[in-house]
């Protein structure tokens, strides 16, 4: 039993952690920077969609990118519980902490704010400077989506390092792990074409999920061949005319479930990736 | 003056680089295994592809991922002159081989059957297990095209690396290159698209160059809508139905000269980054 | 229903230009569909020449891209071909037609005989 | 290219007989094969796409089968004014034809 509660540990955790990350701003601050030069190129290339089917690829292209960007971005979370491997077990045993105090200490003033910041920072310059869907329901919906993605992504490098005491086997398994989550994105592959034997792959790709969230909240009512009545009933299967049509050939449902069933697996991982560490914590202390 | 010739030297440095890499085979033969790994990982995920527009979206991804794959895992060549850095300054010095000697007795033991097949085996797995274009010319263009790439994006390495004393800084100096680079390649933007003022950048993209003559090879006399009835007056308008027509979306000239081309480049390219690592080692020698 | 008819001079002395012309009835060409040459020689042989699409993009034999030049004029719902460099081996019955890509060619012209000789 | 090949060449047959016209690809077309009919002075008629699908207006006794590299064209009861050349064309890489089938009545 512990002398001091729950809130208090976990309160205490979250101070010294910020109090580093402040403490040494360097990394922060040039994550910051990294995210907004990369934002600006990123929207100088793009600049101003078409629609014709330029404006497909190019709208599919810089989506694809921006949620494998946050995947291998996400990469740098598992130094989180890596670096001060020894000093937590250290603590732990002198009772300073539960290991969920910790745990979500850790994750409150470290993976919270560091993961939100790039979503937020890439929506709010690629979002205007590209020309995407002008709606506000779209604009957060694709900041929550990154967000998402970028969480899921940094819990899965969590899941995989925690209790480790090198950061390069960890980092070597993430990036193989996201080549080939990359290729179930749905970019690089049309995932309607893949055989039944290996299409069950695509459900444990997290940027599947961000990119085909991205891709219904973006091309939902575009018109793609403007000019033509996209009322026609287009008996072609080979024209994409619209972006119903390019989603359907995706095969993406059109159905608002369509879209939020994406943010539920993402978050189902995330749990799921999550209990995975923090039960790696459990046992580290254990066998310590 | 050497009392030995510059063939002797680079016999002997060769011999021994060979050695070295037959004396310690698990390295290549790890290499090898990953490479024939993914290459039937490849050729499952895209088996059999259709002459439709998910063909025309697999086929496109399936070159991008070949060329990408090709530069990043080339990002390793940064050891070749970094590892024995030591070592060559000492038996320089000591008056054993010209730089030269050393410099092109590495090149043909360790880079050039180490970086030549990977290219072989793709090509031989994925060729067939995709069903791409069935010419023997095509095939061996396909095979001497990732060949290309990955000799470039060695030499890039080299250029980079030689003579640095860590790999750290160079593989992420690379690593950074590579990601820009992959951008401008033509598959996540439409290189018609980009604004004038920043598309010249796309020339100084090792993979844009791979991809463009891989899809040259590939696309050219491809027929993507075939049997469509030719009596149904349908609105076929905005469909891509030849592979000319996507490679003249695409800004790709169809001319044979738009196909070689792009080993042209890649071959300059090479010739300018070897020279570049030469004159790095030529200069480390002189502030040793 | 769409109509097809091929018209140009018949004769055409060896290294000049041949020019044909292709009147398009009953569909506008720029509402669809590409726009094909397709030639039979003397022995038979057909040869695809090449297209001009609905959006004026141009594909071409590559066998003849060096001399051969398809375009259109919208107004008058007209696409022609121009073949340069004329030899002998160009003597065939040009016939024009209506398809999407490669595909079967449902609409023809009733085709135009084109000698070349000195 | 392609080449497509049909014999043979000429073929002469009695009215009502069931006939065949070859036609060999130089390398697998994956069904991508059209039949066309064309009388003296005439312009070629589509019979036959995909290699066994019928064109509108194309009476039944016609019909098309095959697939890989070798295909075939069957007029089922020849009739008088099926007398014509017919020609074979491949679309899955380009577009060639064949040198075509000249048939005639016996």
């Known amino acids: 039993s512990y002398t001091t509660s729950f809130c208090h540990q976990l309160r205490w955790v979250s101070k010294r952690s910020f109090k580093n990350l402040l403490g040494n701003p360097q990394a922060s601050i040039a994550q910051i920077i990294v995210t907004v030069i990369l934002g600006l190129v990123i929207g100088a290339i793009y600049f101003g969609l078409n629609n014709d089917s330029t404006g497909i690829q190019n709208r599919a292209g810089v989506l694809f990118f921006l949620t494998t960007n946050q995947c291998f971005s996400s990469v740098s979370a598992v130094e989180l519980f890596v670096v001060e491997k020894k000093l937590f077990i250290h603590e732990y045993i002198s009772g300073y902490y539960r290991v969920s105090s910790y745990f979500f200490g850790k994750l409150l003033s470290d993976l919270l704010p560091m993961r939100m910041l790039p979503s937020i920072i890439f929506t709010c310059i690629v979002y205007f400077m590209l020309g995407l869907k002008p709606t506000a329901d779209a604009f957060f919906i694709m900041m929550f989506t990154l967000m998402m993605v970028a969480y899921s992504a940094s819990s899965m490098a969590l899941a995989i390092a925690a209790g480790q005491s090198v950061v390069s086997v960890a980092t070597l398994l993430m990036t193989i792990c996201f080549v080939f989550m990359m290729i179930f994105s749905g970019l690089l592959v049309n995932l309607t074409t893949i055989a039944s034997w290996l299409s069950w792959l695509q459900y444990f790709s997290i940027p599947r999920y961000g990119f085909t969230a991205l891709q219904h909240n973006e091309f939902l009512g575009q018109n793609f061949c403007p000019g033509l009545n996209a009322t026609v009933n287009n008996t072609c299967n080979y024209a994409t005319c619209t972006g119903e049509e390019y989603l359907t050939k995706q095969g993406i449902d059109l159905s608002p479930w369509g879209l939020w069933k994406n943010h539920v697996a993402l978050a189902c991982m995330i749990v799921i990736f999550l209990t995975i560490a923090y039960l790696k914590l459990l046992f580290l202390k254990k066998y310590s | 003056s050497y009392t030995t010739s510059f063939c002797h030297q680079l016999r002997w440095v060769s011999k021994r680089s060979f050695k070295n890499l037959l004396g310690n085979p698990q390295a290549s033969i790890a290499q090898i295994i990953v490479t024939v790994i993914l290459g039937l990982v490849i050729g499952a995920i895209y088996f059999g592809l259709n002459n439709d527009s998910t063909g025309i979206q697999n086929r496109a991804g399936v070159l991008f991922f070949l060329t990408t794959n090709q530069c990043f895992s080339s990002v390793s060549a940064v050891e070749l002159f970094v590892v024995e850095k030591k070592l060559f300054i000492h038996e320089y010095i000591s008056g054993y081989y010209r730089v030269s000697s050393y410099f092109f007795g590495k090149l043909l033991s360790d880079l050039l059957p180490m970086r030549m097949l990977p290219s072989i085996i793709f090509t031989c797995i994925v060729y067939f297990m995709l069903g791409l274009k069935p010419t023997a010319d095509a095939f061996f263009i396909m095979m001497f095209t990732l060949m290309m790439v990955a000799y470039s994006a060695s030499s890039m390495a080299l250029a980079i690396a030689a003579g640095q004393s860590v790999v750290s800084v160079a593989t992420l100096l690379m690593t950074i290159c590579f990601v820009f680079m992959m951008i401008f390649s033509g598959l996540l933007v439409n290189l018609t698209t980009i604004a004038s003022w920043l598309s010249w950048l796309q020339y100084f993209s090792i993979p844009r160059y791979g991809f463009t003559a891989l899809q040259h090879n590939e696309f050219l006399g491809q027929n993507f809508c075939p049997g469509l009835n030719a009596t149904v007056n349908n609105t076929c308008n905005y469909a891509t139905c030849t592979g000319e027509e996507y490679l003249t979306k695409q800004g790709i000239d169809l001319s044979p000269w738009g196909l070689w081309k792009n080993h042209v480049a890649l071959a300059c390219m090479i010739v300018i980054f070897l020279t570049i690592a030469y004159l790095k080692l030529l200069f480390l020698k002189k502030y040793s | 229903e769409v109509q097809l008819e091929e018209s140009g001079p018949g004769l055409v002395k060896p290294s000049q230009s041949l020019s044909l012309t292709c009147s398009v009835t009953g569909y506008t060409i720029t509402s669809g569909y590409d726009w094909t040459w397709i030639r039979k020689f003397p022995g038979n042989k057909m040869e695809w020449m090449g297209y001009?699409?609905?959006?004026?993009?141009?594909n071409y034999n590559p066998s003849l891209r060096s001399r051969i030049s398809i375009t259109r004029d919208t107004s008058k719902n007209q696409f022609f071909l121009q073949l340069n460099s004329v030899t002998t081996e160009d003597t065939a019955t040009y016939y024009c037609?209506?398809?999407?890509?490669?595909?079967?060619?449902?609409?023809w012209g009733q085709g135009a005989s084109v000698s070349s000789a000195s | 290219d392609i080449v497509m090949t049909q014999s043979p060449s000429l073929l002469s047959a009695s009215v009502g007989d069931r006939v065949t016209l070859s036609c060999k690809a130089g390398r697998n077309i994956n069904n991508y094969l059209a039949w066309y009919q064309q009388k003296l002075g005439k312009a070629p008629k589509l019979l036959i796409y995909n290699t066994n699908s019928l064109q509108t207006g194309i009476p039944s006794r016609f019909s098309g089968s095959g697939s890989g590299t070798d295909f075939t064209l069957t007029i089922s009861s020849l009739q008088p004014e099926d007398v014509a050349t017919y020609f074979c064309q491949q679309y899955n890489s380009w577009t060639t034809f064949g040198s075509g089938t000249k048939l005639e009545i016996k």
């Open positions: 037609t209506r398809t999407r890509g490669y595909n079967p060619f449902a609409y």
């Open positions: 001009i699409s609905y959006s004026g993009f141009t």
